[in-house]
Amino acid sequence: EEELQVIQPDKSVSVAAGESAILHCTVTSLIPVGPIQWFRGAGPARELIYNQKEGHFPRVTTVSESTKRENMDFSISISNITPADAGTYYCVKFRKGSPDTEFKSGAGTELSVRAKPS
């Protein structure tokens, strides 16, 4: 069978300051078992943007319904965008373990922030 793929269809997204940004991510399989997390940037210094289990992410909401069965849409919306939010965002699938290990990352979506329209 085909191995799970993480698809971020948008190479880039441009949002006006103060608006919300939707970052799209889908996966092609329910397995392997493990969570999806969102990061800004790559490498050891990357910033965690959303993790369903731990942390407090008041500006982030999930696009899919919280009760959707067999969900493969892990898109998120980030509210009240500011220039500080610019960067490349990665949707990352982890394989469950102790600890969870990174399995596959999407190609990334670059978020650019336009000036607030006057």
């Epitope: 069978e1 191995e3 799970l4 399989s29 329910l30 397995i31 392997p32 078992v33 493990g34 969570p35 999806i36 369903q52 289990k53 999930t62 899919s64 319904e65 919280s66 009760t67 959707k68 069965r69 067999e70 969900n71 892990f74 394989r95 469950k96 373990g97």
Partner: antibody, heavy 120, light 108 residues
Framework: EVQLLESGGGVVQPGGSLRLSCAAS????????MTWVRQAPGEGLEWVST??????YYADSVKGRFTISRDNSKNTLYLQMNSLRAEDTAVYYC???????????????WGLGTLVTVSS | EIVLTQSPATLSVSPGERATLSCRAS??????LAWYQQKPGQAPRLLIY???IRETGIPARFSGSGSGTEFTLTISSLQSEDFAVYYC??????????FGGGTKVEIK
């Protein structure tokens, strides 16, 4: 219609081995994680093992003795049980995993179970 | 490991009455909790997932509530086919998946 049918149970002496099978139909078997849950006589439910694709997970009580595997070409789940003990005596159920949104797994379909008795 | 404690162990109820079953988790499991029904000699059957969502085909008299560490399964008007053992299961933090010890609902 989803169907799960376990087989392979029986009576075995302590230290012996058994291989359980679970034949699945009615869904895309290769797309779902699968799980074994057991129930000792008169007792509650105990999770045993789960398999995704290559990823496998075990309860501490069976780790190193039991091996879960799957053959997607045959739509079949297996549980190889070695070094069996009296406390492994139970009905073994195979179950299909389901998920909701960003969360973990629960079990939406179960087989009828197969009884494993470990006794000398 | 997250421990689930169900109470009471046995609940004696007359047909037509309401039954309220409790499941307490040893730590926060958010809404990642399912309820199952098991009749003698049968496999468990999924009733509720995500703490409150009824599985397809489950009668409306079954309802789930709660979040965090305290959960309730309510059967609004017990029918004869509802007398069974009920188990809760958490899937927030695993392995291991853990089940409660069960509540037996018997005829009063």
């Amino acid at each position: 219609e989803v169907q799960l049918l376990e087989s392979g149970g029986g009576v075995v002496q302590p230290g012996g081995s058994l291989r359980l099978s679970c034949a699945a139909s009615g869904f895309s078997f290769s797309n779902f994680a699968m799980t074994w849950v057991r129930q000792a006589p008169g007792e509650g439910l105990e999770w045993v093992s789960t398999i995704g694709s290559g990823d496998t997970y075990y309860a501490d009580s069976v780790k190193g003795r039991f091996t879960i595997s799957r053959d997607n070409s045959k739509n079949t789940l297996y549980l190889q049980m070695n070094s069996l003990r009296a406390e492994d005596t139970a009905v073994y159920y195979c179950a299909k995993d389901s998920t909701v949104s960003w969360s973990g797994d629960f079990f939406d379909y179960w087989g009828l179970g197969t009884l494993v008795t470990v006794s000398s | 490991e997250i421990v689930l404690t169900q109470s009471p162990a046995t609940l004696s109820v007359s047909p037509g009455e309401r039954a309220t079953l409790s499941c307490r988790a040893s730590q926060n499991v958010k809404n990642d909790l399912a309820w199952y029904q098991q009749k003698p000699g049968q496999a468990p059957r999924l009733l509720i997932y995500a703490a409150r969502i009824r599985e397809t085909g489950i009668p409306a008299r079954f309802s789930g509530s709660g979040s965090g560490t305290e959960f309730t399964l309510t059967i609004s008007s017990l029918q004869s086919e509802d007398f069974a053992v009920y188990y809760c299961q958490q899937y927030y933090d695993w392995p291991p998946f853990t089940f409660g010890g069960g509540t037996k609902v018997e005829i009063k």
